[in-house]
Interface confidence: medium
């Protein structure tokens, strides 16, 4: 039975040209996290594999940095980066947990950032 829950940074906004941290946190389960995928719509951005470490998609290697933790840092944001992002936790024995984040990249110089939380 899957008992875990995923907390995310929720809906966030950032300024064009800036950077943003996408974070998810899996709690309420003792399952082992074997891999975390970060995806944007149908595109794979990055993978953090428990055995192999971080792999960044070649298409995004110039603008995506691993971490902090299992999170992902997006840099040099453009308006085209606006959209849904998913953290997909592959766990054993529970299975797969998915979290959703919506990012809005704003043209203006003032961007309200959503609530952040620290991952211990």
């Amino acid at each position: 039975m899957m008992t875990g829950t995923i907390e995310t940074t929720g809906n966030i906004s950032a300024e064009k040209g800036g950077s943003i941290i996408l974070q998810c946190h899996l709690s309420s389960t003792t399952a082992q996290v074997t891999q975390v995928n970060w995806e944007q719509q149908d595109q794979l951005l990055a993978i953090c594999n428990a055995d192999l470490g971080w792999h960044i998609s070649p298409s995004f290697k110039d603008r995506v940095a691993p971490g902090p933790g299992l999170g992902l840092t997006l840099q040099s944001l453009t308006v085209n980066d606006t959209g849904e992002y998913f953290c997909i936790y592959h766990t054993y024995p529970d299975g797969t947990y998915t979290g959703r984040i919506f990012l809005e990249v704003l043209e203006s110089s003032v961007a309200e950032h959503g609530a952040r939380f620290q991952i211990p």
Partner: nanobody, 125 residues
């Protein structure tokens, strides 16, 4: 940290067979796919075959029907059975590991960041 060690290379006559092995150690979960690559003298490294998520397999056109990839999870070992070998199969063969995901069944080396040291296969009469 995952470490990969290949073995089984050597000298074989055209038309002959070899079986390469790649032993994996240092893993915690084994949640990754594995592939075989080769690099001939003076040429770029190219993909040969891979075992992907769901146990699917893929082969380059040049080896399809002659080579067979397999994986024994109980022994943490990847194999490449090579039959009907040709002179153009001469190369250093490498095994490599990459994260497991549903779109991973290709032979691009981009996602492979963990490599063995290679084993030399020479096909010559």
């Amino acid at each position: 940290e995952v470490q990969l060690v290949e073995s089984g290379g050597g000298l074989v006559q055209p038309g002959g067979s070899l079986r390469l092995s790649c032993a994996a150690s240092g893993y915690k979960y084994g949640v990754y796919s594995m592939g075989w690559f080769r690099q001939a003298p003076g040429k770029e490294r190219e993909g040969v075959s891979a075992i992907c998520s769901g146990g699917r397999t893929t082969y380059s056109d040049s080896v399809k029907g002659r080579f067979t990839i397999s994986r024994d999870n109980s022994k943490n070992t990847l194999y490449l059975q090579m039959n009907s070998l040709r002179a153009e199969d001469t190369a250093v063969y490498y095994c490599a590991a990459r994260p497991l995901w549903t779109g991973d069944c290709d032979l691009s080396s981009s996602w492979y960041k963990t490599w063995g040291q290679g084993t030399l296969v020479t096909v010559s009469s």
